[in-house]
């Protein structure tokens, strides 16, 4: 069966300075392959978080994700500032063979707010 | 640098238990997923055990399950296994090692020798 | 007995180029590495997630996969490439670490 992606909340409201939790699980693990946060959609998307252990700065994990069976990908942003003001997607990639992973699932996407403190 | 340093094997007779541990350095041991693995002698390696890095979840082949337990002391920087019931064919060279995000071995410590004989 | 199977040996002279191949993984739940073992050492990471080398791995040690099967290719074979080379796997729909039985790389 097709694996789903979840991002349940539509939009967050943050203020600057403060921390947010964008939530994101999915239903299977499987093709094997990572799971990435991107702003933005296309070509100009922006990688945010990637959850195959390089370090990003202000970005971090919620859960255990070395649990062999973790299938939740949300992640904290700290210390939020204007600039990441946008949607944010949660992407499931299949890893390629010798090639680029490819995408094969993303969620509905949640629209990050932030307001002045 | 990355350093794992295993302890705690010896000789010890069927049936009888021991314990391994894996002292662990240069890294942020409490972030990342550690397993260990064995090599009889003149054999390949064998997976025996794994553990997350917070330590709640752990994983074992048919092998050594009900035998053998993974745990870990993160206050500590230290990886343990617990060998029970301990069999001829559990002489080995036990090694930890520590895992990537997708479970695979990056690092290896240099082993502890465990002999099970009468 | 082990889930994956790599040929028990490979001779190759020194400066041609080494390909050892492992099969017997599905490929949507498995991810692969290779480790090298000299006598009386610890294994050494040379490649893990089917392709990716550690910094401190010779550019000469390269990974690949096509459908169910790995390769381990070795460039410019040199006489210190010498040692048992394995296969290992995570399967993810098993949450288990299988090996290969290993490949000694004989150097003519």
């Known amino acids: 069966t097709e694996v789903k992606v979840t991002q349940p909340e539509k939009s967050v409201s943050v203020a600057a300075g403060d921390s947010t939790i964008l939530n994101c699980t999915v239903t299977s693990l499987l093709p094997v392959g990572p799971i990435r946060w991107y702003r933005g959609v296309g070509q100009s998307r922006l990688l945010i978080y990637s959850f195959t252990g390089e370090h990003f700065p202000r970005i971090r994990n919620v859960s255990d994700t070395t649990k062999r069976n973790n299938m939740d990908f949300s992640i904290r942003i700290s210390n939020v500032t204007p600039e990441d003001a946008g949607t944010y997607y949660c992407v499931k990639f299949q890893r390629g063979s010798s090639e680029p992973d490819t995408e094969i699932q993303s969620g509905g996407g949640t629209e990050v707010y932030v307001l002045a403190k | 640098e990355v350093q794992l340093v295993e302890s705690g094997g010896g000789v010890v007779q069927p049936g009888g238990s021991l314990r391994l541990s894996c002292a662990a350095s240069g890294f942020t041991f409490s972030s990342n997923a550690m397993s260990w693995v064995r090599q009889a002698p003149g054999k390949g390696l064998e997976w025996v055990a794994g553990i997350s890095a917070g330590g709640s979840d752990t994983y074992y082949p048919a092998s050594v399950k009900g035998r053998f337990t993974i745990s870990r002391d993160n206050s500590k920087n230290t990886l343990y296994l617990q060998m029970n019931s301990l069999r001829a064919e559990d002489t080995a060279v036990y090694y930890c090692?520590?895992?990537?995000?997708?479970?695979?071995?990056?690092?290896w410590g240099q082993g502890t020798l465990v002999t099970v004989s009468s | 007995s082990y889930e994956l199977t790599q040929p028990p040996s490979v001779s190759v002279s020194p400066g041609q180029t080494a390909r050892i191949t492992c099969s017997g993984g599905s490929y949507s739940s498995y991810y692969y590495a290779w480790y090298q073992q000299k006598p009386g050492q610890a294994p050494v990471t040379l490649i893990y997630?089917?392709?990716k080398r550690p910094s401190n791995i010779p550019e000469r040690f390269s990974g690949s996969s096509s459908g169910t099967t790995v390769t381990l290719t070795i460039s410019g074979v040199q006489a210190e490439d010498e040692a048992d080379y394995y296969c290992?796997?995570?399967?993810?729909?098993?949450?288990?670490?299988?090996f290969g039985g290993g490949t000694k790389l004989t150097v003519l």
């Open positions: 290992g796997g995570y399967d993810q729909s098993s949450y288990t670490n299988p």
């Open positions: 090692a520590r895992e990537t995000w997708n479970h695979l071995f990056d690092y």
């Open positions: 997630s089917d392709d």
